[in-house]
Interface confidence: low
């Protein structure tokens, strides 16, 4: 679809005569009839197949024709066509004299014709005007013409329809050749596909408008490149959605079972030593003077044997009190009323005077102790053996007999088979006399809980349209990760059918 435009510029009829040679009275009131038709080697009368147009009286005898396009007038003359421009044409321009006001053909005498020109040729669509001048013996006509496409039509033949749009069906403007030129942020054959936020993950993200990045199920982050771990995953991470890969020291389906309770919770109080002994399990070795699972309970002060020189300890409401043997006094019976002259050192101890004889000190032989060497050394009194070890006196030394699973001079080292956390998938480890045993969580079995016994919900291929299936470990159900253009719990709906719900 397009328009053949004819711009009349100047008509010269100096003598004011008709084609017959007869003069017009009083002058030739001139109007034009234009006929546009298909190409003819010899232009002949007949139907104006591409259209006709007539002008009003434009002037008398000789005159210039004003360009009237801006004022809504009729110059240039418009000959619209609604077919593919063939590239060739024939054009007949007739100048007529109008004796009266009626310009209809049937109202004019046949000899009212002033002049007639006929041209033919090829003409390409374009904005440039072709200037032409036709001269007869009595008249001269100067004019220009061109073919342009109608609005929304493009191409060499005005055959390409293109209408700019910015809606659901496309976001584009039209190029001079009629091809689409996408608006910023859009792509695709019809510019219907938004260009997502730069860096938005190709598989895990999508968008419904430019510079957006919406995440598919199982993914999060500005660019949808971070997986969402399994719902309830406490101390774990993922590399694909719904995974829960435990951080060091954690186990179980949700990585919520503590395999390093001592470090994470510091349960032992009052300076006690903590030992891990399995999942969420620990042992506190208390310092002297404390007891309880977490060594939270302070013992009676008398249990730390504060009274010296054989004094006996009595508990009191506000603390304790030492009852001292004869010859001693002080809060802890630490002061003596004796001197070396009284031979106070027993078991072969040698006496040394102090403070000008006012006091003394005994140097005891091996295996004896006390202010007066009165006590046989019992190296087990301080209960040095940890983890329930039994203390044995061996002459001048002592040794610890350890319970199964413990070793070291003081049974302080745990040699539990469970220390290596051998049970997989959060299984609970139990030390036995001759090894270990794993108690497995639901969905796992085997000596080390290494065998998965739960149903693989993805085995039946429940996801449609090439979606990726993930098994939800806690419920033995599946989650479908849909490809671009599909939604639904099984990715069964193309976008735009039922309303989508972005989770």
């Amino acid at each position: 679809s397009g328009v053949f435009q004819l711009q009349l510029q100047e008509f010269i009829n100096e003598r004011g005569v008709l084609a017959s040679g007869r003069p017009c009275e009083p002058g030739c009131r001139t109007f034009f009839r234009v006929c546009l038709k298909h190409f003819q080697a010899v232009v002949s009368p007949g139907p104006c197949t591409f259209g006709t147009v007539s002008t009003p009286v434009l002037g008398t005898n000789s005159f210039a024709v004003r360009d009237d396009s801006s004022g809504g007038g009729r110059n240039p003359l418009q000959l619209p066509f609604n077919f593919t421009w063939p590239g060739t044409f024939s054009l007949i321009i007739e100048a007529w004299h109008a004796p009266g006001d009626d310009l209809r053909p049937e109202a004019l005498p046949p000899d009212a014709l002033i002049s007639k020109i006929a041209i033919q040729g090829s003409l390409a669509v374009g904005q440039n005007w072709l200037l032409d001048e036709q001269t007869s013996t009595l008249t001269r006509l100067r004019y220009s013409y061109r073919v342009i496409c109608s609005d929304n039509y493009y191409g060499d033949n005005c055959s390409r329809l293109c209408k700019k749009r910015n809606d659901h069906f496309g976001h584009y403007v039209c190029q001079p050749d009629g091809n689409l030129s996408c608006l910023p942020g859009w792509t695709g054959e019809y510019c219907q596909q938004p260009i997502c936020l730069s860096g938005c993950h190709e598989q895990n993200g999508y968008c419904s408008k430019p510079a957006e990045c919406l995440c598919r199920p199982g993914w999060q982050g500005r660019l949808c490149n971070e997986c969402i771990p399994h719902n309830g995953c406490r101390h774990g991470t993922c590399s694909t959605p719904w995974q829960c890969t435990c951080d060091e020291g954690w186990g179980g389906l949700f990585c919520d079972q503590d395999l390093n309770y001592c470090t994470h919770h510091s349960p032992c109080k009052n300076g006690a030593t903590c030992s891990n002994s399995g999942q969420r399990s620990y042992t506190c070795t208390c310092r002297p003077g404390y007891t309880g699972v977490d060594c939270e309970l302070e013992l009676s002060e008398c249990d730390s044997n504060p009274c010296r020189n054989g004094g006996s300890c009595k508990d009191q409401e506000d603390g304790y009190h030492c009852l001292c043997p004869p010859g001693y006094y002080g809060l802890h019976c630490e002061h003596s009323t004796l001197s070396c002259a009284d031979s106070p050192c027993f078991n072969g101890g040698s006496c040394r005077e102090r403070n000008q004889g006012a006091n003394y000190a005994c140097e005891c032989p091996p295996n004896f102790t006390g202010s007066n060497c009165e006590k046989k050394v019992d190296r087990c009194t301080s209960n040095p053996c940890a983890n329930g070890g039994q203390c044995l006196n061996r002459g001048p030394s002592r040794m610890c007999r350890c319970r199964p699973g413990f070793t070291g001079t003081y049974c302080e080292l745990h040699v539990s088979d469970c220390a290596r956390n051998p049970c997989a998938h959060g299984g609970t480890c139990h030390d036995l006399e001759n090894g270990l045993m794993c108690t497995c969580p639901a969905g796992f079995s085997g000596r080390r809980c290494e065998v998965r016994t739960s149903i693989d919900a993805c085995a039946s291929s429940p996801c449609f349209n090439r979606a990726t299936c993930y098994t939800d470990l806690s419920t033995d159900t599946f989650v479908c990760n849909c490809p671009y253009g599909f939604v639904g719990s099984r990715c069964e709906f193309p976008v735009g059918l039922p309303p989508s719900f972005p989770w």
């Epitope: 999060q220 719902n231 309303p499 719900f501 972005p502």
Partner: antibody, heavy 120, light 108 residues
Framework: QVQLQESGPGLVKPSQTLSLTCTVS??????????WSWIRQYPGKGLEWIGY???????HYNPSLKSRLTISIDTSKSQFSLKLSSVTAADTAVYYC????????????WGQGTLVTVSS | EIVLTQSPGTLSLSPGERATLSCRAS???????LAWYQQKPGQAPRLLIF???SRATGIPDRFSGSGSGTDFTLTISRLEPEDFAVYYC?????????FGGGTKVEIK
């Protein structure tokens, strides 16, 4: 323990905008694992889900209210809010805010609710 | 949207009796996406069951959920005085999220 508390005017005139705020305490509103929702209950006891917001600012609304609805979040104040424009008497209800786990939109934690009456 | 129809509208029972509440969906709902709530006058709803059959934290084991597809059931094995309330089902597998109209369990 997460706690939610609604606040806002109890009386709104027809054609005006209903505005409510929900303050979250005892837990982080910035956790990526949750959606923060608004739900209302009509005097006749029917419950209607209004919409949700994620800490990232992404929202999803009930289509029946979408044209009148804005839900937004302010993580710095640990609050999310509801704006419902052009209200009528039909919007009179008890409005609740609630928290749902991401991917599983059941509501384990609710505010105590606030009655909003639309009347001139 | 998925319409959830609860029946009966009212259930009159005595303490100690068994209560069976029904929730029927207008189209299939994955059992992973159905929840039950209890609501007492002047209070917000309280989550009882999610995933059709998983009990929420602190919910007594007399409450149990079952069902799949379009038919779901909440069962209270022995009614305690504090169980008399309104019960709602909710689906969260399709947009918009929808609730049932509720079943009132009252003392006979």
């Amino acid at each position: 323990q997460v706690q939610l508390q609604e606040s806002g005017p109890g009386l709104v005139k027809p054609s005006q905008t209903l505005s409510l705020t929900c303050t979250v305490s005892g837990g982080s509103i910035s956790s990526g694992g949750y959606y923060w929702s608004w739900i209302r209950q009509y005097p006749g006891k029917g419950l209607e889900w209004i919409g949700y917001v994620h800490y990232s600012g992404s929202t999803h609304y009930n289509p029946s209210l979408k044209s009148r609805l804005t839900i937004s979040i302010d993580t710095s104040k640990s609050q999310f809010s509801l704006k419902l424009s052009s209200v009528t008497a039909a919007d009179t209800a008890v409005y609740y805010c609630a928290r749902a786990p991401r991917g599983y939109h059941y509501f384990a934690y609710w505010g105590q609710g606030t009655l909003v009456t639309v009347s001139s | 949207e998925i319409v959830l129809t609860q029946s009966p509208g009212t259930l009159s029972l005595s303490p100690g009796e068994r209560a069976t509440l029904s929730c029927r969906a207008s189209q299939s709902v994955s059992s992973r996406y159905l929840a039950w709530y209890q609501q007492k006058p002047g209070q917000a709803p309280r989550l009882l069951i999610f995933g059709a059959s998983s009990r929420a934290t602190g919910i007594p084991d007399r409450f149990s959920g079952s069902g799949s597809g379009t038919d779901f059931t909440l069962t209270i094995s022995r009614l305690e005085p504090e169980d008399f309330a309104v019960y709602y089902c909710q689906q969260y597998g399709s947009s918009p999220l929808t609730f049932g109209g509720g079943t009132k369990v009252e003392i006979k």
